[in-house]
């Protein structure tokens, strides 16, 4: 014997209530496949979620996060607060990274220069707080005359962090 | 979607060499911090440490330090966790998860096994 | 490094509150946030940033982090919420996530 509810198409449910019979998903819910006996309830984007796209009697709300944040998570089921290039997000908000870290993204948190003489090369160019030092090419392979700038940036072996 | 999917269970012997991967898709993979978990038969949760995998960044917690190795390939979006020198002691269940503090995405675990 | 201390179990009838404990020196200091996970699976955000709830995860779950304690509460406890809870913490000093050693909640 088939189950009458498998006929119920996707946006209905099957109504127990009323003799198995196929009802719309009331107002803020919805189903997304046949056969479903309850309407899931919509998902909401409150406070720092916004709605990227409206529920359907067949398919969820979809959020993204408003600006000056950022998802994370399936979904976007959560969201972080931004910082600008060369900051890290602690509890008491977006802090300056200290000197000899860097951060390139609107997120994550800052990391030591690389030691370019740990490579045998030397500093071409100078870190910043949102850029990384750029590496040359080694002290021995420059030109007699030259110099190259060598700023006291912290060690970068692997497993070692700022202080 | 993003997806962070490990490699499968391993059967060691003690003094054996081992590496692991969790190769990351759906995202910006060089971008985001890879973290890795240990996971001791019925206990609990242990962070081991995390790369950067834009610049092979790593940092260890103290408890792992000199025991393991945390590397990365972002040309093909996938993270290790590798050992020179197996133990018994090393037998769990090994998570790498996207995340230095909240980690959002979670790979399915690699079970390790060490005993002779 | 901060060492995060939960409970080793805690247990509640259906429909009471749960309340499951995280401490650590000034744990309040900085962000807390709680993982649950069940047998044979891979632990899942319920609550990040002391107080914030991924959408997906019941309004029955909330937290709060303040002085040396951060707290998962869990208001009308459900069968479905038996597992084990882990809190855990980003620390600036040492750039180390650390993990509280677990509790495991009973709905009995």
């Known amino acids: 014997l088939q189950d009458p509810c498998s006929n119920c198409p996707a946006g209905t449910f099957c109504d127990n209530n009323r003799n198995q019979i196929c009802s719309p998903c009331p107002p803020n819910s919805f189903s997304s496949a046949g056969g479903q006996r309850t309407c899931d309830i919509c998902r909401q984007c409150k406070g720092v979620f916004r709605t990227r796209k409206e529920c359907s009697s067949t398919s969820n709300a979809e959020c993204d996060c408003t600006p000056g944040f950022h998802c994370l998570g399936a979904g976007c089921s959560m969201c972080e607060q931004d910082c600008k290039q060369g900051q890290e997000l602690t509890k008491k908000g977006c802090k300056d990274c200290c000197f000899g870290t860097f951060n390139d993204q609107k997120r994550g948190i800052c990391r030591p220069w690389t030691n370019c003489s740990l490579d045998g090369k030397s500093v071409l160019v100078n870190g910043t707080k949102e850029r990384d030092v750029v590496c040359g090419p080694s002290p021995a392979d420059l030109s007699p005359g030259a110099s190259s700038v060598t700023p006291p940036a912290p060690a970068r072996e692997p497993g070692h962090s700022p202080q | 979607q993003v997806q962070l999917v490990q490699s499968g269970a391993e059967v060691k012997k003690p003094g054996e060499s081992l590496k692991i991967s969790c190769k990351g898709s759906?995202?910006?993979?060089?971008?985001?911090?890879i973290s890795w978990v240990r996971q001791m038969p019925g206990k609990g949760l242990e962070w081991m440490g995390k790369?950067?995998?834009?610049?092979?960044?790593?940092n260890y917690s103290p408890s792992f330090q000199g025991q393991v190795t945390i590397s990365a390939d972002k040309s093909i979006s996938t993270a290790y966790l590798q050992w020179s020198s197996l133990k018994a002691s090393d037998t769990a269940m090994y998570y790498c998860?996207?995340?230095?503090?909240?980690?959002?995405?979670w790979g399915q675990g690699t079970l390790v096994t060490v005993s002779s | 490094d901060i060492e995060l201390t939960q409970p080793p179990s805690v247990s509640v009838a259906p429909g009471q509150t749960a309340r499951i404990s995280c401490s650590g020196d000034?744990?309040?200091?900085?962000?807390a946030h709680w993982y649950q996970q069940k047998p044979g699976q891979a632990p899942v955000v319920v609550i990040y940033?002391?107080?914030n709830r991924p959408s997906g995860i019941p309004e029955r779950f909330s937290g709060s982090n303040s002085g040396n304690t951060a707290t998962l509460t869990i208001s009308g406890t459900q069968a479905e919420d038996e597992a084990d809870y882990y809190c855990?913490?980003?620390?600036?000093?040492?750039?180390?996530?650390?993990f509280g050693g677990g509790t495991k909640l009973t709905v009995l």
């Open positions: 855990s913490t980003y620390t600036f000093v040492g750039f180390t996530t650390v």
């Open positions: 940033q002391d107080k």
């Open positions: 759906g995202y910006s993979f060089s971008t985001y911090w």
């Open positions: 790369i950067y995998p834009g610049d092979s960044y790593t």
């Open positions: 000034n744990i309040g200091d900085q962000y």
């Open positions: 998860a996207r995340g230095y503090g909240i980690f959002d995405y």
